[in-house]
């Protein structure tokens, strides 16, 4: 039977009975927060073979192995993950081994096994046989391997029963427990699964099968399951569902959403039955089961009960995330904040229409209104006293409204008002009048020419670049020397630059008045020689990366009541030269016959240019006789068991420090001090652990139902 849409077993171990008839859990399985140690031996769920999402175990007292509970769990599909993980085993105080001896495939996601003080048999499992890439696995803070003495079946009797593989250059037996080997299929099967008798399954099978080369005998399917068969794609008139099976239209139409009872029901899109239309699509009518593409961002109407929504923090802006039409008025009052411009863009950047008025006052943190990057219509259905539908008052750092070269904004009804915006040039306001169609509506006092732009260099000249030179990590640029009417008014230049994959950046992107700026800034003093053109060498750049660069002249901004001239360049886009790529990732090699090696890898994380080919080199190496000289299984090698505390410590030194040559002298050696990079890595590691733990707690601790 298919169970779902996710099973959460907590507090009472007897809830496990819910799994009795499950063959597939369509969703996740949580077993957690069972604080009283119980005897789990009477609980066994041999029918369960597949979990389509993830398995999470957290603080289950008394549970020593998962093998008895889930002897036939074969596949965890990872269709949805828990913080990138398909298997999470966290703070399981009594777990001694994982023991999932039939687990053959984790289709997507990694594993996280952390803070399990008594957990052994971790180094004996070859996860690369189960997962595609093991680099994201996180196995930390469990019982130290040297205190485990993990022995695979038969090794004590010198009749080893398990097969060997190499992990981290260590060739060893692979097993789940003291009496269960890790199953490996013959190399002749390649990527295919195999039966218990090592016969290759049908290519559409995943994990295992009950008969060879038969797509009706699979334990789980590589692609999709329909009518008892593993199929590469769903047959006509059926639709992919939850990433593993095919369902018909009627089934899809009648699924009750687990998340909400008032949802509109599932939709069919692109051959899949899904909870809602994907990004960029909208239902073709409220009762429709089908999706159509949105023209631009998909509409989402948001309404404010009190008519006027005050945006005075990131938190208040968060309520507007995804909104494209705002029914009501916007009052923006942002006095301070961290990284405010990009946060506001994140939450308000999709708003296209405001039905009422927009008022921006005392927003000293704002440099630009470009965070409202899709605003195209202010209807002015409701207006402020004096018939204003766009009102901008006392914003000490506001320099730009929008980039009018790339912006169409219409104000359908009402007037504009601007006062006490000392860095906002009047020319910017006049430009807005023209674009928005409000020219002629304003009376003389509505746009104050004395207190708008009084502290800005409003008449800008254009600085022209004269030369650019690039290398793999440097850019050298020079520009014409700017000559204001009075040479003494020119103080220096500021060069702004940042990575720009696309040629669509503006000067005010990500900039606010509280110090946040997506641009890097470098000051350039005036060359003492009046005939030398100013310039700069930008270094420490990334190879084969496009940068946007512009230059501003820093001038004295006030000469009594005159607005003095400033100067800045256009934005220049320039790409650094290509360089040697970083190393290819996740290199794996396996032999599929006596004369062949199959080598796989992922592209480098930093291609530093357009990759055209890879070079694969190999050489024959002598067999390491050392592997055969030691008997790793003799009893005297087994260390005394000591219980770990489940915390993550630096490995203790249990022996006396070795005497070895160090710094040219004989004598006891101290550990080398950690490099900055190592310290940084440790800091990041600790941070990552905290983030995961917070995510775990936030996900699983929920208020008791009323």
């Amino acid at each position: 039977e298919i169970c779902g849409p996710g099973i959460d077993i907590r507090n009472d171990y007897q809830q496990l009975k819910r799994l009795e008839n499950c063959t597939v859990i369509e969703g996740y399985l949580h077993i957690l927060l069972i604080s009283k140690a119980e005897d789990y031996r009477s609980y066994r769920f041999p029918k369960l073979t597949v979990i389509t999402e993830y398995l999470l175990l957290f603080r289950v007292a008394g549970l020593e192995s998962l093998g008895d509970l889930f002897p036939n769990l074969t596949v965890i599909r990872g269709w949805k993950l828990f913080y990138n993980y398909a298997l999470v085993i966290f703070e399981m105080t009594n777990l001694k081994d994982i023991g999932l001896y039939n687990l053959r495939n984790i289709t997507r996601g990694a594993i996280r096994i952390e803070k399990n003080a008594d957990l052994c048999y971790l180094s004996t499992v070859d996860w690369s046989l189960i997962l595609d890439a093991v680099s994201n696995n996180y196995i930390v803070g469990n019982k130290p391997p040297k205190e485990c003495g993990d022995l695979c079946p038969g090794t004590m009797e010198e009749k080893p029963m398990c097969e060997k593989t190499t992990i981290n250059n260590e060739y060893n037996y692979r097993c789940w427990t003291t009496n269960r080997c890790q199953k490996m299929c013959p190399s002749t099967c390649g990527k295919r699964a195999c039966t218990e008798n090592n016969e290759c399954c049908h290519p559409e099978c995943l994990g295992s099968c009950s008969a060879p080369d038969n797509d009706t005998a699979c334990v789980a399917c590589r692609h999709y399951y329909y009518a008892g068969v593993c199929v590469p794609a769903c047959p006509p008139n059926t639709y992919r569902f939850e990433g593993w099976r095919c369902v018909d239209r009627d089934f899809c139409a009648n699924i009750l959403s687990a998340e909400s009872s008032d949802s509109e029901g599932f939709v069919i899109h692109d051959g899949e039955c899904m909870q809602e239309c994907p990004s960029g699509f909208i239902r073709n009518g409220s009762q429709s089961m089908y999706c159509i593409p949105c023209e631009g961002p998909c509409p989402k109407v948001c309404e404010e009960e009190k008519k006027t929504k005050t945006i005075d923090s990131v938190t208040s802006a968060q309520m507007l995330q995804g909104c494209t039409i705002f029914k009501g008025n916007l009052l923006i009052n942002i006095r301070r904040g961290n990284n405010i411009a990009s946060e506001l863009e994140n939450f308000m950047g999709l708003i296209e229409v405001v039905t009422g008025y927009v008022k921006i006052r005392h927003s000293h943190a704002l440099v630009s209104l470009s965070f409202l990057k899709n605003l195209r219509l202010i209807l002015g259905e409701e207006q402020l006293e004096g018939n204003y539908s766009f009102y901008v008052l006392d914003n000490q750092n506001l320099q730009q409204l929008w980039d009018w070269d790339h912006r169409n904004l219409t104000i359908k009804a009402g007037k504009m008002y601007f006062a006490f915006n000392p860095k906002l040039c009047v020319s910017e306001i006049y430009r807005m009048e023209e674009v928005t169609g409000t020219k002629g509506r304003q009376s003389k006092g509505d746009i104050n020419t004395r207190n708008n732009g009084e502290r800005a260099s409003c008449e800008s000249d254009v600085l022209h670049f004269t030369s650019t030179t690039t290398s793999k990590n440097r850019i050298i640029i020079t520009w014409h020397r700017y000559r204001p009417p009075d040479y003494r008014d020119l103080i220096s230049f500021t060069v702004y630059y940042k990575e720009a994959p696309f040629k669509n950046v503006t000067e005010y992107d990500g900039q606010d008045a509280c110090g946040s700026n997506s641009w890097n800034m470098v000051d350039v003093d005036l060359p003492p020689n009046k005939d030398v053109e100013p310039g700069i060498l930008l270094h420490g750049l990334k190879p084969w990366t496009q940068y946007a660069v512009y230059v501003k002249a820093v001038t004295l901004t006030m000469v009594e009541n005159d607005h003095i001239r400033g100067a800045k360049s256009e934005i220049l886009y320039i790409r650094t030269n290509a360089s040697v790529p970083s190393i290819p990732l996740d290199v794996l090699s396996a032999s599929n016959s006596s004369s062949q090696l199959i080598v796989k890898w992922n592209p480098p994380s930093l291609p530093n240019g357009n990759l055209s080919y890879y070079i694969v080199r190999w050489q024959r190496q002598p067999q390491d006789g050392y592997l055969y000289r030691h008997n790793y299984c003799s009893k005297d090698k087994i260390p005394i068991r000591k219980y770990a505390d489940g915390t993550i410590d630096i490995e203790e030194v249990t022996e006396n420090p070795k005497t070895e040559v160090c710094g040219g002298e004989k004598g006891p050696c101290c550990a080398c001090p950690k490099t900055e990079a190592e310290k940084q890595a440790e800091k990041e590691e600790a941070e990552y652990r905290k983030v995961f733990e917070n995510f775990l707690h936030n996900s699983i601790f929920v208020p008791r139902p009323e």
């Epitope: 039977e1 298919i2 038969n214 009706t216 329909y226 009518a227 008892g228 068969v229 047959p235 059926t238 569902f241 099976r245 095919c246 369902v247 018909d248 239209r249 009627d250 089934f251 139409a253 009648n254």
Partner: antibody, heavy 122, light 107 residues
Framework: QVQLVESGGGVVRPGGSLRLSCAAS????????MSWVRQAPGKGLEWVST????????YYADSVKGRFTISRDNSKNTLYLQMNSLRAEDTAVYYC???????????????WGQGTTVTVSS | DIQLTQSPSSVSASVGDRVTITCRAS??????LAWYQQKPGKAPRLLIY???GLQSGVPSRFSGSGSGTDFTLTISNLQPEDFATYYC?????????FGQGTRLETK
Amino acid sequence: QVQLVESGGGVVRPGGSLRLSCAASGFTFSSYAMSWVRQAPGKGLEWVSTISGSGGSTYYADSVKGRFTISRDNSKNTLYLQMNSLRAEDTAVYYCAKERGSGWSLDNMDVWGQGTTVTVSS
Amino acid sequence: DIQLTQSPSSVSASVGDRVTITCRASQGISRWLAWYQQKPGKAPRLLIYAASGLQSGVPSRFSGSGSGTDFTLTISNLQPEDFATYYCQQASSFPITFGQGTRLETK
């Protein structure tokens, strides 16, 4: 264990009506499509009707379309077949059957009831 | 509608024999064909689904093959309890249809 028990069969005159019921147990009834299949005396199997797990879709053989109505009550784990305008050729053993898979209505039937006899005779 | 024609309509065999029954569809049905066994006075029992899938609990001496329009049910090493009537059924499209049946009797 999974079980289906039909009831409601009997003798009825031509033109008359009858309602068959099928009580299900041992499985999640609402997850599976259900069917009625009949077998006239000494003849082969004939499919009559199928209803999806939710009850949202129904399918009928041409020979019964417009006269028979299949329905289900998922809260009672019961399947029904309302038979109106009965004819002599409707005389048969009527079996209710569970479809094998969950998620689609068109499938094979893996669990069958013991059958209930309907006789249409004047 | 898709017609299914079974042949032979009856077959005589002895315990231990190998018996093959065929089912031909009037149009392609991919592999969506099932086989049932029915004994007198009893309800049918599903043996094979999707042309070759062995239903759980069914002995492995029953096997199915074929796709498109031609399908076969094979019983190897016939046992006394296998004497019954066998039906094929298509699940490719509505209306669902059954073959007319093949009676397997003792020689």
